[in-house]
């Protein structure tokens, strides 16, 4: 008789999840000499231990502490790039500007990027059929708690000038319910962080509006100001040109507004 299994509203665990995590870990530690000491089998065991046999709506940050410990990594605190709803461009940027880091450029972020996972209470099985959806099912699910934990730690580590890339094509350029708005903003440390600089990325070619004057950007400034962190904002009118100029800063066309 097939055992009854909880049906969640979200997609199930990414296929070949254990193999993917292990392979990513090996690849990352090969590319990044400072992480060569990491034992990827132990990393996978700690990752698995965070959610296997646990109810997927009862996951806590504590569950991920062994993994956090193994994945401890020092990135230059003044070279952090946060992003919200514009992951691809942020990643393209750090691939060119190699001295800056998004969360997904760190080991733990790299391991989990674009993956889904969950287990089942009291069984050692991984659920490949469905996992809890943050809105429809529960917020304390394995994926959401993981990203909340690593995002908080990443923001807490930041110092000096922190950059954030925001999507100017969205109705809420700054969304308080995003990971950036709900976790990272509130975990920047005013004793260490002097300025948050927002880069608002324009979508339309003919869009010459000053999106730094958008009401949601002013809401972001309002939040940041209470925490005594300075705020600045720049429009990136031409993201394609922006990336090109990061690659070739000497290009004559790169002196004008981008």
């Amino acid at each position: 008789v097939p055992r009854w299994r909880q049906q969640w509203s979200g997609p199930g665990t990414t296929k070949r999840f254990p193999e993917t995590v292990l392979a990513r870990c090996v690849k990352y530690t090969e590319i990044h000499p400072e992480m060569r000491h990491v034992d990827c089998q132990s990393v996978w065991d700690a990752f698995k231990g965070a959610f296997i046999s646990k109810h997927p709506c009862n996951i806590t940050e504590e569950d991920y502490q062994p993994l956090m410990k193994l994945g401890t990594q020092t990135v230059p605190c003044n070279k952090i790039l946060l992003w919200s709803r514009i992951k691809d461009l942020a990643h393209q940027f750090t691939q060119v500007q190699r001295d800056m880091f998004t969360l997904e450029d760190t080991l733990l972020g790299y391991l989990a990027d674009d993956l889904t996972w969950c287990g089942e209470f009291n069984t050692s099985k991984i659920n490949y059929q469905s996992c809890p959806d943050w809105r429809k099912d529960c917020s304390n699910n394995p994926v959401s708690v993981f990203w909340k934990t690593v995002s908080r730690r990443f923001a807490e580590a930041a110092c000096d000038v922190v950059h954030v890339m925001l999507n100017g094509s969205r109705s809420k350029i700054f969304d308080k319910n995003s990971t950036f708005g709900s976790v990272e903003v509130h975990n920047l440390q005013p004793e260490k962080v002097q300025t948050l600089e927002a880069w608002v990325i324009h979508g339309g070619r003919e869009d010459s509006r000053d999106l730094c004057q958008d009401p949601t950007i002013k809401e972001l400034e309002s939040i940041i100001s209470k925490r005594n962190i300075q705020f600045s904002c720049k429009n990136i009118y031409r993201p394609d040109k922006f990336l090109q100029c990061v690659k070739n800063p000497e290009d004559s066309s790169c002196t004008s507004e981008i």
Epitope: K172, P215, E219, S222, R227, N228
Partner: antibody, heavy 118, light 109 residues
């Protein structure tokens, strides 16, 4: 002249409701987070509620949560406080105040008095 | 019971210097913007100090400082018109709320 003018206060019985309004003039209302702060007779200042620039999020003091609702109409340059299930301890002068980034509550109204008594 | 702690009263003679303290925690004064408000008898509060700075129009006799989880307001060259209630305030990250001190009544003797 930068000004905030509260209205809507009065005498109400316990369990009753009141709606306070705060009309803003002399500044761009839609650029500011707004607040209600109250002061019971002979007591100190107590923050009641805040609303973000677009009105998309709100915060409340524990003492009023579930009973008071803050809202704003940027087209009318007006802030509101809907007060339901009023209690004797809600008796106070209610001030509206803007929040200017990096400054604090830099413009205050003169206040409107709410008295909850049977 | 206020989240921020102030002495209920302070006093001084004209020309003297008085200091009013405000004690909080890491989630408010420790990390966030601190304000001081002056409330003259029968009037609305007025912003006096923001983040240890003075808004325009506030005399330079008033100054603010902050150290760790405490803040202070200093008034030098005390004048009779300084007789008022003084409140400290800060945003509290844990409570998601503005928190005020209980207020200090300053008497000019």
């Amino acid at each position: 002249e930068v000004q905030l003018l509260e209205s809507g206060g009065g005498l109400v019985q316990p369990g009753g409701s009141l709606r306070l309004s705060c009309a803003a003039s002399g500044f761009t209302f839609s650029d500011y987070e707004m607040n209600w702060v109250r002061q019971a007779p002979g007591k100190g200042l107590e923050w009641v509620s805040s609303i973000s620039i677009t009105g998309s999020w709100t915060y409340y003091a524990d003492s009023v949560k579930g009973r008071f609702t803050i809202s704003r109409d940027n087209s009318k340059n007006t802030l509101y406080l809907q007060m339901n299930n009023l209690r004797a301890e809600d008796t106070a002068v209610y001030y509206c105040a803007n929040y200017k980034s990096y400054y604090g509550m830099d413009v205050w109204g003169h206040g409107t008095t709410v008295t909850v008594s049977s | 019971q206020s989240v921020l702690t102030q002495p209920p009263s302070a006093s001084g003679t004209p020309g003297q210097r008085v200091t009013i303290s405000c004690s909080g925690s890491r989630s408010n004064i420790g990390t966030n913007l601190v304000n001081w408000y002056q409330q003259l008898p029968g009037t609305a509060p007025k912003l006096l100090i923001y983040n240890v700075q003075r808004p325009s129009g506030v005399p330079d006799r008033f100054s603010g400082s902050k150290s760790g989880t405490s803040a202070s307001l200093a008034i030098s060259g005390l004048q009779s018109e300084d007789e008022a209630d003084y409140y400290c305030a800060a945003w509290d990250d844990s409570l998601n709320a503005w928190v005020f001190g209980g207020g200090t009544k300053l008497t000019v003797l």
